[in-house]
């Protein structure tokens, strides 16, 4: 019919939900695309319409809101599944319209199966805990709005397959899981299952997240340059290959950008004419401390190159450091035959 502002398929919102569990999905129009909320739209006489395209089909069809026990329903700007089924997977569209205005967006919904240990194709959020940092908590995510505050759900926490009980340093406290002192052994997948009653039925919400124990800010230091250092001299003859590694250790710092770069005579390698290549490799410790190595390479070094200043620089949120490499031209070894001849008094 008439023109509609189509925001297309919002793949940024790849929604994954577990089979046989309730799901509440807000229309993304009001969250990401329009400058007004549902209440404003509703009071202005706009109607929100939902429809969907099944997986592996092209045909858009209306959502059946007349299923037994109101399995799928709409409430304001939320589409409810109580509960989901595997074949609910597809692209869902919410359209806001009246006679003069129309705007719509689609988003993919994937209903996912889990196994007996809560493993599934679900993309898991990662929660980082600082090692040996004191009490830290994780909270069962994305359960708001499923039941009123008057309902008291039960929450069971699992690590992998096993209920968390009698763990030395991990204590379930309702919606929170407390780590008294996080250790590397606490790395893993944690699942909370929230059970609540509604209209004579029992519903379950399963939420899994990955816990990664990382370096503590208490132990964080500015970058440490292990190489180049004062003990190694890069002595080369013209024509040889010059290889200088810059190896830098970075403490883990949340949201820190770690950088390593070379300067040659105070300039970035890109800004000078010599034929230089730089290769970088990165490795991580178990607590996500980072070691970056940048190898500066000049295939056929000239005597001019051997007089230049080669400095490795490193920067993190903790500070900036630099270290010059000791580069020098190798003094050629005396030619044996000439020396010998001279030694015997030959002319």
């Amino acid at each position: 019919s008439e023109r509609c502002d189509d925001w297309g398929l919002d793949t940024m919102r790849q929604i994954q939900v577990f089979e046989d569990e309730p799901a509440r999905i807000k229309c993304p129009l009001f969250e990401h695309f329009l400058k007004f909320n549902y209440s404003t739209a509703h009071s202005a006489g706009l109607t929100l319409i939902w429809y969907w395209t099944r997986q592996d089909r092209d045909l858009e069809e209306p959502i059946n809101f007349r299923l037994p026990e109101n399995r799928i329903s709409k409430e304001k700007d939320v589409l409810w599944f109580r509960p989901t089924l595997l074949n609910d997977t597809g692209n869902y569209t919410c359209m806001l319209r009246n006679t003069t205005y129309c705007s719509k967006v689609a988003f993919p919904l994937e209903v996912v199966q889990k196994d007996s240990c809560f493993n599934s194709p679900m993309k898991l959020p990662v929660h980082k805990l600082y090692i040996e940092y004191g009490i830290q908590r994780i909270t069962c995510p994305n359960v708001d709005g499923y039941f009123p505050s008057s309902v008291k759900p039960t929450i069971t926490w699992y690590m992998g397959c096993y209920k968390i009980q009698n763990f030395n340093n991990v204590i379930p406290e309702g919606m929170n899981l407390s780590f008294l002192i996080a250790l590397i052994s606490n790395n893993g997948n944690y699942t909370c299952v929230v059970t609540y009653p509604e209209n004579g039925r029992t519903f379950h919400l399963t939420r899994t997240l990955t816990v990664k124990v990382v370096g503590s800010p208490k132990n964080a230091v500015p970058p440490v340059i292990h190489s180049p250092n004062d003990h190694v001299v890069y002595e080369k003859e013209p024509g040889e290959e010059l290889l200088i590694p810059c190896t830098v250790y970075f403490s883990f710092l949340m949201d820190s950008r770690n950088e390593v770069w070379w300067t040659i005579d105070g300039k970035k390698p890109d800004d000078i004419t010599i034929d230089v290549t730089i290769n970088e490799s990165i490795s991580h410790s178990r607590t996500e401390d980072e070691t970056r190595t940048q190898i500066l390479s000049i295939k056929k070094v000239t005597s001019e190159d051997l007089k230049r200043s080669y400095v490795c620089h490193a920067r993190s949120a903790k500070g900036e450091v630099a270290k010059a490499a000791k580069v020098k031209q190798k003094v050629p070894a005396p030619r044996y035959t000439v020396e010998l001849a001279c030694g015997f008094g030959a002319t």
Epitope: E19, D20, P83, K114, D115, S116, K163, Q165, V193, H204
Partner: antibody
Framework: QVQLVQSGAEVKKPGSSVKVSCKAS????????MNWVRQAPGKGLEWMGR????????HYAQKFQGRVTLTADKSTSTAYMELSSLRSEDTAVYYC??????????WGQGTLVTVSS | DIQMTQSPSSLSASVGDRVTITCSAS??????LNWYQQKPGKAPKLLIH???GLHAGVPSRFSGSGSGTDYTLTISSLQPEDVATYYC?????????FGGGTKVEIK
């Protein structure tokens, strides 16, 4: 709503086997545990084991290990409990019980198995 | 295996009475305790999960409490339809184990 319908009563000879079925409807069969519990006449409840039809994972009580086999047919949403080497003390009502987690939320009506020579 | 001991094994009370059944575990079960109701000739029904969580559709006169090894089921005002045998069950550690049951009758 959730329904678990079990097969009918069985009379078996000592040393033989029995296979009890439990057909599930009203929920996603592959997403919940199916437990098996028995109750001897006039006695209490005894947990035998459980199966997760989604991946076939099973847990058995030590007492029944090697004598009980739990299986599930996803295509028909039916769980089975087979008990072998029957003896007179296996005479009991056998229940299937569905649980999304560990509590058994819903139970079948029970199947009486009588072991008699 | 964890042993579950229920008491009393039977009780008789009047309609409207407050009834308490206790369940003791041989070791701490971290609140992983269910209560089931079984009426004569019927399958058990889940009443309470995780010590105090009322199962959907269960009347609010039923409540559960406890921690560690000791747990309680309370019927605040006994009704004729509550005549049944009540079982506690731990689900802390496999194998799941049940108490011996408490038979509740009306005086």
């Amino acid at each position: 709503q959730v329904q678990l319908v079990q097969s009918g009563a069985e009379v078996k000879k000592p040393g033989s086997s029995v296979k009890v079925s439990c057909k599930a409807s009203g929920y996603t069969f592959t997403s919940s545990w199916m437990n098996w519990v028995r109750q001897a006449p006039g006695k209490g409840l005894e947990w035998m084991g459980r199966i997760y039809p989604g991946d076939g994972q099973t847990h058995y009580a030590q007492k029944f290990q090697g004598r009980v086999t739990l299986t599930a047919d996803k295509s028909t949403s039916t769980a089975y409990m087979e008990l072998s080497s029957l003896r007179s003390e296996d005479t009991a009502v056998y229940y299937c019980g569905e649980g999304y987690l560990d509590p058994m939320d819903y139970w079948g009506q029970g199947t009486l198995v009588t072991v008699s020579s | 295996d964890i042993q579950m001991t229920q008491s009393p094994s039977s009780l008789s009370a009047s309609v409207g009475d407050r009834v308490t059944i206790t369940c003791s575990a041989s070791q701490g079960i971290n609140n992983y305790l269910n209560w089931y109701q079984q009426k004569p000739g019927k399958a058990p029904k889940l009443l309470i999960h995780y010590t105090s969580g009322l199962h959907a559709g269960v009347p609010s006169r039923f409540s559960g409490s406890g921690s560690g090894t000791d747990y309680t089921l309370t019927i605040s005002s006994l009704q004729p339809e509550d005549v049944a045998t009540y079982y506690c069950q731990q689900y802390s550690i496999l194998p799941w184990t049940f108490g011996g049951g408490t038979k509740v009758e009306i005086k």
